[in-house]
Amino acid sequence: VEVQVSEDPVVALVDTDATLRCSFSPEPGFSLAQLNLIWQLTDTKQLVHSFTEGRDQGSAYSNRTALFPDLLVQGNASLRLQRVRVTDEGSYTCFVSIQDFDSAAVSLQVAAPYSKPSMTLEPNKDLRPGNMVTITCSSYQGYPEAEVFWKDGQGVPLTGNVTTSQMANERGLFDVHSVLRVVLGANGTYSCLVRNPVLQQDAHGSVTITGQPLTF
């Protein structure tokens, strides 16, 4: 028996369902009574879901997995993973045994888009050219860790005096806080770009300082 899976990682958004595709070519006369199908975590070999002993044995993994029972006899051994979580990320092995056996691994990459950044300024009044200001760009609940870029109004990258911190919350999603310390010019726009490297999603925020009032 030959097992086939997609070579590219499966990218799934947090809280959506993902299908890990796996197929085998059944011989003529194949019946499900002969099938041992096991999905397991590749690294730890922890059972995820199985069809053995003549029946779907159900989920051994958070009760969020399912097979496609009507398609098994055709050789479709794919696994449905519901309400994907950050902790689901990793490699899954599809193991199929009929008379002989084969297995293959498929990677699940979890992702979540970052929110539109909110911008704050400190101090936020009585600003004069030459003042040192702190601009904070905050974006929430993304995954995996973001890449953060700062630019001025002319699109020139600002790399000095930038401090970025990323903290995972209880769901494993990251909140990003990036702080730019800059000396004010006569007027200017400062923009921050938060990029999700997996989704290639960019979230933009900017602040324009033109004396008073400030525009965000």
Epitope: N36, I38, Q40, T44, K45, Q46, L47, S50, T52, E53, Q57, G58, A60, T93, F95, S97, F101, S103
Partner: antibody, heavy 115, light 106 residues
Framework: QVQLQQPGAELVKPGASVKLSCKAS????????MHWVKQRPGQGLEWIGM????????NYNEKFKSKATLTVDKSSSTAYMQLSSLTSEDSAVYYC????????WGQGTTLTVSS | DIQMTRHPSSLSASMGERVSLTCRAS??????LSWLQQKPDGTIKRLIY???TLDSGVPKRFSGSRSGSDYSLTISSLESEDFADYYC?????????FGGGTKLEI
Amino acid sequence: QVQLQQPGAELVKPGASVKLSCKASGYTFTNYWMHWVKQRPGQGLEWIGMIHPNSGSTNYNEKFKSKATLTVDKSSSTAYMQLSSLTSEDSAVYYCARRGDGDYWGQGTTLTVSS
Amino acid sequence: DIQMTRHPSSLSASMGERVSLTCRASQEISGYLSWLQQKPDGTIKRLIYAASTLDSGVPKRFSGSRSGSDYSLTISSLESEDFADYYCLQYASYPYTFGGGTKLEI
């Protein structure tokens, strides 16, 4: 005929580890899940976990995840369960059983944890 | 986890008598239940699987049935070798769980 052979007894000291064995014969070892079950003296049966010899896939009762480690040696058709950091609470009879519906059982190994 | 509640915990009966033991499942187990017999020497043997299917070699006086979430093992006419402990085992969902066991005494 299907047979699951287990040593009769093991005596170990508290804090130590022990590796219990279950040698299978009379069937194709790699085709069936092997399960492990605990029975404390005068008590009922408790499911510890299971291992599929061919894939090496394991599934543990949450209660025993940090206590038991299941492995197999396909060449000798033997399943093993290692129990770590032993205390008197681990003194029990440990059974191996084939399949989830328990179609065949070993005779059980009596584990005594005592100094 | 699925709880399997057995009734009774012990039962005194005479040879030739008809007895029934029951296990109640706390959640749906769809008939995925075995009945096991444990002899005083610790030997465990499966009698019934899939709630009502008799294992080969098991005497016909043993039978299994289901009524909703209640699963019963009936011995139609007790013989001396039937005096033992009996357990139900649900294998519908992980972790698999056993009933507390019924001690059948003379």
